[in-house]
Amino acid sequence: DWVVAPISVPENGKGPFPQRLNQLKSNKDRDTKIFYSITGPGADSPPEGVFAVEKETGWLLLNKPLDREEIAKYELFGHAVSENGASVEDPMNISIIVTDQNDHKPKFTQDTFRGSVLEGVMPGTSVMQVTATDEDDAVNTYNGVVAYSIHSQEPKEPHDLMFTIHKSTGTISVISSGLDREKVPEYRLTVQATDMDGEGSTTTAEAVVQILDANDNAPEFDPQKYEAHVPENAVGHEVQRLTVTDLDAPNSPAWRATYLIMGGDDGDHFTITTHPESNQGILTTRKGLDFEAKNQHTLYVEVTNEAPFVLKLPTSTATIVVHVEDVNEAPVFVPPSKVVEVQEGIPTGEPVCVYTAEDPDKENQKISYRILRDPAGWLAMDPDSGQVTAVGTLDREDEQFVRNNIYEVMVLAMDNGSPPTTGTGTLLLTLIDVNDHGPVPEPRQITICNQSPVRQVLNITDKDLSPHTSPFQAQLTDDSDIYWTAEVNEEGDTVVLSLKKFLKQDTYDVHLSLSDHGNKEQLTVIRATVCDCHGHVETCPGPWKGG
């Protein structure tokens, strides 16, 4: 029959070539001479000429060694034609199967594989996987079937069989207990991949297993007892650096220390932080310590890690004896800010108040006083008694120095300690108003027509406070009332000035006396420009020169 069973050809054949494979034969050759040919990849299309057929004999030839890893199967067509070129058979499938030879060693996908596992894990824990490939056939033969094994382990501690590898998957697992990062931080395994399912060619690679840190070591104080000296009152002062050792991986949460003051700090005077590089506990004062109240503190500090312990571990404790050192403390004014009411304009030499300071120190130190800041120079202070007296006129209405009736003075107290220290106090003088200012009209110049004049409304101001202000009273003096009238409005805070007789165009002085509710009188001269005009005017019309 015009059929060829699949032809198996081993790869890497040694020849000699051409090599006979099979004979194509049509039974039509009884009737006529048959010519044979083949087509397909490997025959008349790339890779061309690998296979050929003798036209008259039908012998199929192989012209070169085959490589299964390049082409594993060739699918050709055989043709049979008569002498006149007519096809005598349908094209026949010719399958050439390239059978595998074990001509490739396994190859690891990496020279070095890296994996990691936590120290102290149980046997059976998976670590990593190594992979090797083999180009040979692993389906129909064992040529490409890779078996993995561990050839060696370095270091061989605690013994040489800490790991195992799955023969077929390459998964490396822990086989023994005793992984301890602090003793062996890294293992180097020489792994083997062997084809023929472990019976053939071998290749090696390195598997580096990093042992990851677990918090299986507690930090320990070294030393456990400390003595420190701290000046009183110092806030944020470094008292002591506490040193710990921890065998776990530096700069990891299992190594980084967490400090806690367990006792001895009832007043919450201290705080402890961890230094980010050295891991030391930095004990500092949260508040100032008071030598006079307590001159020694005994603190108990416990250390743990940022990460929890993976097993029950004893906690290390340190004892710190803090000796508080006496310092010369500054006098403190009582109160720190003193408010005193005083009448403005009191006579020079009149006492204002006594403002004194207390010294926190136990010794009876002498305190002397002086004024530190007195912007207007109105006050003096007795250095011994702290008596404050007026040496200038206190003026409530002085806008340069007085704000909201308050005059602010800073005073200084100095003790006679060694070295001397100073404290300051603030004296706030609330100045009580006296009727020392009369009412004043605004504006003090007016322009008015001499015919149908418009009434001029003047505002009245008084620097004093109520009740030394409105209602005001107005009165014209020095014959000004002949030509003018002045009336205070109902509210009593404006005065209306009216021209009651004709005056020729000129400038006139109007003498206006205003008095406040406390009868403080103030005489003001109003300059009135009279113009030849009717009604309202801003400036006199025409070329006119005031006399």
Epitope: K14, G15, P16, F17, P18, R20, L21, Q23, F35, S37, E48, G49, V50, A52, V53, E54, K55, E56, T57, W59, L60, L61, N63, K64
Partner: antibody, heavy 118, light 107 residues
Framework: VQLVEESGGGLVKPGGSLKLSCAAS????????MSWVRQTPDKRLEWVAT????????YYPDSVKGRFTISRDNAKNTLYLQMSSLKSEDTAMYYC???????????WGQGTTVTVSS | ELVMTQSPSSLSASLGEGVSLTCRAS??????LIWLRQEPDGTIKRLIY???SLDSGVPKRFSGSRSGSDYSLTISSLESEDFVHYYC?????????FGAGTKLEIK
């Protein structure tokens, strides 16, 4: 009838070159592998070169590899052997022979003599 | 390379007599062996291929056989044209190698 006829033999000095030809007739030349075989003066036969039917692949023994080149022109039904760096031991009768039934050497020519001598 | 040891190198026999020529292969070549004959004028012809298959036009007095690594050409009844040179060639291993030849002479 399959016929092959060699030509191109002659006398050549050592280190010289020579090209032999083999004209084929009476069969489909392009579908058969072809070879050169030589017979030394002591009557020993030695395979020299083979070329696949399509001319894609060539084969040589170590004794001539790198010095001899076999080629073919299927359009002209002609086989060639280019010989260079000739040695006295290359002196022989050179035959061209065809594969037949997928094996050597089904049909032989009459041969052409090559003499390498100074 | 594979060596073909042909024996005898020469053989005298009478017309009508039967003779056998032998080639021994130094390695396994399977059935990949042919026998050739060379006429006095240098003409070479293949007689047998694949150890025992007769080429077309070859008389039936010629036959080939194998016993292990020994390959034989047998001429059952010698005729006058048979007194020529005979060679074996193996094509089971590369390179192709010939036997040294046997010269068959008339007694």
């Amino acid at each position: 009838v399959q016929l092959v006829e060699e030509s191109g033999g002659g006398l050549v000095k050592p280190g010289g070159s020579l090209k032999l030809s083999c004209a084929a007739s009476g069969f489909t030349f392009s579908s058969y592998a072809m070879s050169w075989v030589r017979q030394t003066p002591d009557k020993r036969l030695e395979w020299v070169a083979t070329i696949s039917s399509g001319g894609h692949y060539t084969y040589y023994p170590d004794s001539v590899k790198g010095r001899f080149t076999i080629s073919r022109d299927n359009a002209k039904n002609t086989l060639y052997l280019q010989m260079s760096s000739l040695k006295s031991e290359d002196t022989a009768m050179y035959y061209c022979a065809s594969y037949y039934y997928g094996i050597p050497f089904g049909y032989w020519g009459q041969g052409t003599t090559v003499t390498v001598s100074s | 390379e594979l060596v073909m040891t042909q024996s005898p190198s020469s053989l005298s026999a009478s017309l009508g007599e039967g003779v056998s020529l032998t080639c021994r292969a130094s390695q396994d070549i399977g059935i990949n062996l042919i026998w050739l004959r060379q006429e006095p004028d240098g003409t070479i012809k293949r007689l047998i291929y694949d150890t025992s298959s007769l080429d077309s036009g070859v008389p039936k007095r010629f036959s080939g056989s194998r016993s292990g690594s020994d390959y034989s050409l047998t001429i059952s009844s010698l005729e006058s044209e048979d007194f020529v040179h005979y060679y074996c060639l193996q094509y089971g291993s590369s390179p192709l190698t010939f036997g040294a030849g046997t010269k068959l002479e008339i007694k």
